[in-house]
């Protein structure tokens, strides 16, 4: 007869191993005991249980509560067990002794293989703002055995670096992606996308990127000039800029306080019916956390009457 | 036919020692581990040492530890419990009995003496 | 330790009375139990071994079963020969332990 087992056992943490020890005997042959041992290079082998054909399963005090037979139906040949719960301490050599009559002993050796998962983690970079250099924008990390592969998945050109960490049962993997922060990465998407043989599928932890960043601000509403005459309604002008964070806006007249009656709503300033005294020197200032900007417009309210007497003299003059 | 005969019994004083034998005859005693068992008057079995074949590893109920020492003398087919600071709960007739099978879990007493019995009394 | 609780503690019986003694472990003890039988100024005698394993020389009428934490002794047909003491013992684990024994009385 001979035994039949697996080289290689692979099992995720927290998962049932199945520890596979068949006899696969001649007619007649009978299986009295099977004795299941840990038996690690340089140490001693430390019994885990005894399938005896009578007794039943014996579990030594250390593995009590952990080891099983499978489930029925049973063969009388099979020595199998179930380590339950496997945990990465289990991982190491495992040795079946199956004792038989009248052929004898045998025995069999095999390697359990713990898979444990990683529980990645992804830790954004120090702010990114438009105008630095080649900046870190995340650094993803995953501790795993064996050692995970971390990779990045985004739209966004940069650069990639990793490290590995050994420690005695697993190995931690960072990776971090660099870039140059411009404003058109802003809610762009970059995704640690870590793989391992004990997972199901990737896992994937996606960060938005922020690029903090102010444009230039202009005003519009002075386009038509002649637009802005004494009497007119529904006067404004607009102040355009755009930023990360969303930037704020405030009107100022640089040469005095704003006349009475005009309206500051955000980016825009509404005027009451013009008169010459709206005319001047008006300010918007943009500004966030990263940035502010100035635009300043001249505003010069033409008077019909002057105007028409103008051209008249001019008519008279030709 | 396996046969186990206790002797060293008798009568001592709460403190006192007393050395117990068993002597084995018709069958390979040395293949086999070998236990005592003892019974207090009128009360059920209570196991009290065990020892390998090879006199590896004894073990003890508690209620004996660090005062019993059990031994075999291979050569003479002969099991012995060296009993000390005796109590009077330690009266009891005591049984040697041998294991079926040489391990440390796992046995069935399958042959018995017929008993010492040890009575501590002041 | 394991606690081997057997019931009842006595019972009476006639001859020809299938008797049935039952024995519970305090944890798994998948099979390893032993009954004996014990009459008075008497060694134990080995009955049943692997909780349904009869031993050499003992009587057919005596039969064991059980496994993990729950065990039975039946004597099919009393004998007068079989009032006795009977007392099972599991050896899982160190301490071997035993029940308290169950007495078998002419009724």
């Known amino acids: 007869g001979e035994l039949e087992t697996s080289d290689v056992v692979t099992v995720v943490l927290g998962q049932d191993a199945k520890l596979p020890c068949f006899y696969r005997g001649d007619s007649g042959e009978q299986v009295g005991q099977v004795a299941w041992a840990r038996v690690d290079a340089g140490e001693g082998a430390q019994e885990l249980a005894l399938l005896h054909s009578k007794y039943g399963l014996h579990v030594s005090p250390a593995y009590e509560g952990r080891v099983e037979q499978p489930p029925p139906p049973r063969n009388p040949l099979d020595g199998s067990v179930l380590l339950r719960n496997a945990v990465q301490a289990d991982e190491g050599e495992y040795e079946c002794r199956v004792s038989t009559f009248p052929a004898g002993s045998f025995q069999a050796r095999l390697r359990l293989r713990v898979l444990v998962p990683p529980l990645p983690s992804l830790n954004p970079g120090p702010a990114l703002e438009e105008g630095q250099g080649l900046t870190l924008a995340a650094s993803c990390t995953a501790e795993g055995s064996p050692a995970p592969s971390v990779t990045w998945d985004t739209e966004v050109k940069g650069t990639t670096s990793s490290r590995s960490f050994k420690h005695s049962r697993s190995a931690a993997v960072t990776s971090e992606f660099h870039l140059v922060p411009s404003r058109s990465m802003n809610g762009q998407p970059l995704t640690c996308v870590v793989s391992h043989p004990g997972l199901l599928q990737d896992q994937r932890i996606t960060h938005i990127l922020h690029v903090s960043f102010l444009a230039e601000a202009s005003v519009r509403g002075l386009e038509d000039q002649n637009l802005w005459h004494i009497g007119r309604e529904g006067a404004m002008l607009k102040c355009l800029s755009e930023g990360q964070p969303p930037p704020s806006y405030n009107w100022t007249r640089l040469d005095g306080p704003l006349p009475s009656g005009v309206r500051v709503d955000g980016d825009t300033l509404g005027f009451p019916p013009l008169t010459t005294e709206h005319s001047g020197i008006y300010v918007c200032h943009v500004s966030n956390e990263f940035s502010s900007r100035d635009s300043q417009v001249t505003v010069d309210v033409l008077d019909p009457q002057e105007d028409s007497g103008k051209q008249v003299d001019l008519v008279s003059a030709s | 036919e396996v046969q186990l005969v206790e002797s060293g019994g008798g009568l001592v004083q709460p403190g006192g020692s007393l050395r117990l034998s068993c002597a084995a005859s018709g069958d390979s005693f040395t293949s086999y581990a070998m236990s005592w068992v003892r019974q207090a008057p009128g009360k059920g079995l209570e196991w009290v040492s065990r020892?390998?074949?090879?006199?590896?590893?004894?073990s003890y109920a508690d209620s004996v530890k660090g005062r019993f020492t059990i031994s075999r003398d291979n050569s003479k087919n002969t099991l012995y419990l060296q009993m000390n600071s005796l109590r009077a709960e330690d009266t009891a007739v005591y049984y040697c009995?041998?294991?079926?099978?040489?391990?440390?879990?796992?046995?069935?007493?399958?042959?018995w003496g017929q008993g010492t019995l040890v009575t501590v009394s002041s | 330790d394991i606690q081997m609780t057997q019931s009842p503690s006595s019972l009476s019986a006639s001859v020809g009375d299938r008797v049935t003694i039952t024995c519970r472990a305090s944890?798994?003890?998948?099979?390893?139990l032993a009954w004996y039988q014990q009459k008075p100024g008497k060694a134990p005698k080995l009955l049943i071994y692997a909780a349904s394993s009869l031993q050499s020389g003992v009587p057919s009428r005596f039969s064991g079963s059980g496994s993990g934490t729950d065990f039975t002794l039946t004597i099919s047909s009393l004998q007068p020969e079989d009032f006795a003491t009977y007392y099972c013992?599991?050896?899982?684990?160190?301490?071997?332990?035993f029940g308290q024994g169950t007495k078998v009385e002419i009724k």
């Open positions: 013992q599991q050896h899982y684990t160190t301490p071997p332990t």
């Open positions: 009995a041998r294991q079926t099978e040489d391990r440390s879990y796992g046995y069935d007493l399958d042959y």
């Open positions: 020892i390998s074949a090879d006199s590896a590893s004894p």
């Open positions: 944890q798994g003890i998948s099979s390893y």
